[in-house]
Interface confidence: low
């Protein structure tokens, strides 16, 4: 027979629970064994004091009597041959050599029937407090603080952890949240992250990714101060922060058993998130411009921000719907999270810049608005975090109020009057056809362009094809040509300010069509840009290229 | 008064840099397009480059494509024509003019470029 | 590009003449044509816009006619201070383009 107990000596911290293991092997009898419980005290090295029995309930001497009938102290079996002696609240008199026996059940008497093992009670020295976290955050003056961040700001906090027990121990530190005023326990409190008393970092399961990220950070600073660092705050890191130290001791068997516990309330964080505080304003008020004008339109973005940096950025744009057009609109310019800026669809080839002129106003300028810039304006910003390690996250947007915005049409009048000259034409020859274009209103430096068109029958029908162009000039000056059905040489060109010649070479019976003249005119801004500020369309004039009688 | 004051000008070796600055007063800067003119001694007028009032497009000559860039700061009234690779036919006169009717004249600086 | 020739490159008169000058464009410029003048060792000056108008301050002898292609520049009684180089410039299209130059030289 032998009887089993821990290697000796072991350290424990008064006021702490212990459990000292005790199995017999090797014996003979029944498979359920009895266990004794003894204590030899420093003082009285020779006087063995019954603390508990698996076998007789009145075996508790004095000392132990009242601590085993609370429960304070028992016996608990494990199996038939094992059994643990647990002392809920150790006290310094709990020092000195536990003596594990079993009465013997054996036919002869073999072997050892109690094992010896020694506990020394340390007192009470672990100390956790919390510490100033370093300059982020806003901390009023309660205790514990309560500390306001902002969604994507770090949320950092401080614990000061130290021990004076004469033996080697380590600490083990970590940090946990537990929902706002909820009681602190084991089942309420959500680890965050730890150290291990090995140094290795750990963060509950919720965490672990963030921890992975780089995003959660916990460091050593100095011998007894330790420092959490929540990178990208969120809405659900909101809570009641501890910080709960653990003292760690080796036993002589090589396990590691924690000693001591103790936990301190940090601070009740709240996360002010963006979307409760971005709000977007537009100004001036509403505009009323002339074509060409320039248009500048102004939008503040307000609220308890972090400035744009490492936690935080903003991307401002603008919208824009024509009047009477549902929903928000299309885009017209905006600037992203770098600063970058860049214009809508339908908008590039525009004179338009998008710029920040303060720290939390941005503007948009239209060198040279048009008729068509006309409607609702809205300015729409948003706020993004950095989520793990550099990537951003929409974390709120808010658009403004609608801005109208009126610009006057340029009134300009056009009516086109088109004719082939001679009136009747021959095969081979040249057809001239000349268009005649009037205006009335339009600004100075008004310019013409005209297109000639061309639809062709087909049996006898026009044919349900669009018109195709067949050329014109532009604006510019500059001749575009199109394609002519006869696939033959093609001239358009200016033979007055206000009036275009369009003529087809050698005519062939593939020419034979409608054509017309489409003039439009044009207005170029200070910025260079052109808009149509009005168009028309001739009346119809039919080609027909005729036979000479002798041609075959 | 409406007034251009160019500055800026010297001699460089070929292949070497300068950056020439228009000093503008009396009127809305950035309301107007501002050019850059230049004068080879002996020579004719020449446009060398413009550029919108808020700064927005830029314009260039062939000759000096890819080699001047043109700009402007409107908050201090000042245009500015950066020269680099310079050769010795950009010798000249520079002169800085307001609108596309280059109705004011600054009174020019000289530029010389020679080895 | 438009390009700007300028027609006589040099011409002698007295005081008094009547002078004209004509610039044709490679392409119609409509009327964006300006007229300048240059004596040695300033900058030009700007007499007339849009082919017709005249800049402010520039005496009435100068005026400006043409559309399209072809614009001239007359001086109706020709003054001594009238005697330096005039340019045309194109303001169409960019390049802007300046004509060659007419040098009026006392007769």
């Known amino acids: 027979r032998e009887v089993l107990v821990p290697e000796g000596p072991l350290y424990r911290v008064a006021g702490t629970a212990v459990s000292i293991s005790c199995n017999v092997t090797g014996y003979e009898g029944p498979a359920q064994q009895n266990f004794e419980w003894f204590l030899y005290r420093p003082e009285a090295p020779d006087t063995a004091l019954g603390i508990v029995s698996t076998k007789d309930t009145q075996f508790s001497y004095a000392v132990f009597k009242s601590r085993v009938v609370a429960g304070e102290v028992q016996v608990q079996r494990l199996q038939g041959d094992a059994v643990v002696l647990k002392i809920a609240r150790l006290q310094a008199q709990d020092a000195g050599i536990y003596e594990c026996h079993t009465p013997s059940t054996d036919t002869r008497y073999l072997g050892s029937y109690s094992g010896k093992v020694e506990l020394r009670v340390l007192p009470d020295v672990l100390q956790v407090s919390a510490a100033p976290p370093g300059p982020r955050g806003r901390q009023a003056p309660t205790s514990p603080p309560r500390m306001t961040v902002h969604e994507g700001q770090e949320l950092a906090l401080g614990c000061l952890a130290r021990t004076s027990t004469q033996k080697h121990t380590h600490l083990a530190v970590s940090f946990g949240r537990s929902v706002p005023e909820a009681p602190v326990g084991r089942s309420t409190l959500q680890e965050v992250v730890g150290i291990r008393s090995d140094l290795a970092v750990e963060a509950g399961a919720p965490y672990a990714e963030r921890l992975a990220a780089g995003e959660l950070r916990l460091g050593k600073e100095g011998t007894d101060r330790y420092r959490m660092v929540v990178g990208g705050a969120q809405a659900g890191d909101a809570g009641t922060y501890h910080c709960t130290a653990a003292e760690w001791i080796q036993d002589p068997d090589g396990s590691w058993a924690q000693i001591a516990e103790k936990r301190a309330v940090l601070a009740h964080v709240d996360v002010q998130t963006l979307s409760s505080q971005l709000a977007v304003t537009v100004g001036p008020g509403e505009r009323r411009i002339g074509p060409g004008e320039p248009l500048e339109l102004l939008c503040n973005v307000s609220g308890a921000l972090p400035p744009a940096g490492r936690h935080a950025a903003y991307s401002v744009g603008w919208e824009m719907a024509p009047a009477g057009a549902p929903g928000p609109g299309r885009l017209v310019a905006q600037l992203d999270t770098e600063g970058v800026g860049s214009l809508g669809p339908g908008y590039e080839g525009r004179h338009i810049a998008m710029e920040k002129v303060a720290s939390r106003t941005y503007r948009l300028r239209l060198e040279a608005a048009r008729p068509g810039d006309a409607g609702t304006y809205r300015c729409l910003a948003k706020a993004y975090v950095r989520g793990s390690g550099t990537r951003l996250r929409e974390a709120a947007s808010a658009r403004s109020r609608p801005l109208p915005v009126h610009v006057r049409e340029e009134g300009v009048v056009l009516e086109a009057v088109a004719w082939l000259a001679g009136g009747t034409v021959y095969r081979g020859e040249t057809a001239s056809l000349l268009c005649n274009i009037s205006v009335r209103g339009g600004p100075p430096g008004l310019r013409l362009a005209a297109s000639w068109w061309v639809e062709r029958p087909e049996d006898g029908e026009l044919s349900s094809v669009p018109a195709q162009l067949v050329g014109g000039v532009g604006q510019d000056g500059v001749a575009e040509l199109g394609v002519r059905p006869g696939g033959g040489p093609v001239s358009v060109e200016l033979v007055g300010p206000r009036s275009h010649r369009l003529r087809l070479h050698s005519l062939g019976p593939e020419d034979e069509g409608v054509y017309h003249c489409a003039p439009s005119a044009w207005v170029q801004h200070a910025d260079y840009s052109w808009y149509q500020a009005g168009s028309a369309r001739s009346g119809p004039v039919t080609v027909y290229p005729y036979m000479h009688a002798l041609d075959t | 008064e409406v007034q251009l004051l160019e500055s800026g000008g010297g001699l460089v070796q070929p292949g070497g840099s300068l950056r020439l600055s228009c000093a503008a007063s009396?009127?809305?800067?950035?309301?107007?397009?501002m050019s850059w003119v230049r004068q080879a001694p002996g020579k004719g007028l020449e446009w060398v480059s413009g550029?919108?009032?808020?700064?927005?497009?830029?314009y260039y000559a062939d000759s000096v494509k890819g080699r001047f860039t043109i700009s402007r700061d409107n908050s201090k009234n000042t245009l500015y024509l950066q020269m680099n690779s310079l050769r010795a036919e950009d010798t000249a006169i520079y002169y800085c003019?307001?609108?596309?009717?280059?109705?004011?004249w600054g009174q020019g600086t000289m530029v010389t470029v020679s080895s | 590009d438009i390009q700007m020739t300028q027609s006589p490159s040099s011409l002698s008169a007295s005081v008094g003449d009547r002078v004209t000058i004509t610039c044709r464009a490679s392409?119609?410029?409509?009327?964006?044509l300006a007229w300048y003048k240059q004596k040695p060792g300033q900058a030009p000056k700007l007499l007339i816009y849009?082919?017709?108008s005249l800049q402010s301050g520039v005496p009435s002898r100068f005026s400006g006619s043409g559309s399209g292609t072809d614009f001239t520049l007359t001086i109706s009684s020709l003054q001594p201070e009238d005697f330096a180089t005039y340019y045309c410039?194109?303001?169409?299209?960019?390049?802007?383009?300046f004509g060659g130059g007419t040098k009026v030289e006392i007769k």
């Open positions: 410039q194109q303001s169409y299209s960019t390049p802007l383009t």
């Open positions: 009396g009127f809305t800067f950035s309301s107007y397009a």
């Open positions: 392409q119609v410029i409509h009327n964006y």
């Open positions: 849009s082919a017709s």
């Open positions: 550029i919108t009032g808020s700064g927005g497009s830029t």
């Open positions: 003019a307001r609108g596309g009717a280059l109705d004011i």
